[in-house]
Amino acid sequence: SEVEYRAEVGQNAYLPCFYTPAAPGNLVPVCWGKGACPVFECGNVVLRTDERDVNYWTSRYWLNGDFRKGDVSLTIENVTLADSGIYCCRIQIPGIMNDEKFNLKLVIKPAKVTPAPTRQRDFTAAFPRMLTTRGHGPAETQTLGSLPDINLTQISTLANELRDSRLANDLRDSGATIRIG
């Protein structure tokens, strides 16, 4: 059975595969293919090494470890849902039927859709200005600074309190999802 590995759409996927060279630099050919390991070779080869270097690859498939020390783990750059499936790492040890074969299952999940709490930070950056509020007493100038610890509830409360002020207009103009009034 295959070992399962997961990645999100848009991330890099990592599929580990290792061997120990008999001597430093005494490398063994390796192939990576899409689909379970067949009896010989790799089907749908995406990357191949020889005794010296990577000698074949297709786009987005990388050996990113120290392959000279036997780290032939595959990195797939910027994955899509179509990258899901079984991958074969085949270490082609000389001799009849000596190959080491590893089937690895890659499961790609849709990217998490994060709601926009970053809006809050946008606010913070957007209002380091001075503003004058109209209140019951004399005009009062307040400095908002960069509002480092303010949260959306506080902003909403603040916006309600300052409904008539320029801040309220600024909040509205910023496109943020805060109901005022």
């Epitope: 890099n12 990357l47 270097d53 990577v54 690859w57 297709t58 786009s59 987005r60 498939y61 990388w62 050996l63 990113n64 392959f67 990195t75 750059e77 910027n78």
Partner: nanobody
Framework: QVQLQESGGGLVQAGGSLRLSCAAS????????MGWFRQAPGKEREFVAS????????SYADSVKGRFTVSRDNAKNTVYLQMNSLKPEDTAVYYC??????????????????????WGQGTQVTVSS
Amino acid sequence: QVQLQESGGGLVQAGGSLRLSCAASGFTFGSYVMGWFRQAPGKEREFVASISTSGGITSYADSVKGRFTVSRDNAKNTVYLQMNSLKPEDTAVYYCARDLTYYRTGGRLPDNANGYAYWGQGTQVTVSS
């Protein structure tokens, strides 16, 4: 013609940070892997880090893993090397280099000087203890 200009080097205390920049011109920057190397006095030039065309794949020498971060901005034709937790043994001239291969889309990021065609003049980084 191809030009690579490093900047951002200097003298820093052990444990400190520096950010090196390499401004590139004279070629289609976004179509080449870029690398950083360094050379200490009396030593051979050694690989530090490299980054794929899109910036999605990076590779590091064991000696800098977890401390250095390579990045690139293709809109600004610039590659960066953020160096944190610097050690005296990081003292060297740091060079930016451009890959030999046009639009390397996969395989392996080159970590040998022979894999790079063009080099900057270098910027000195000195880490004092």
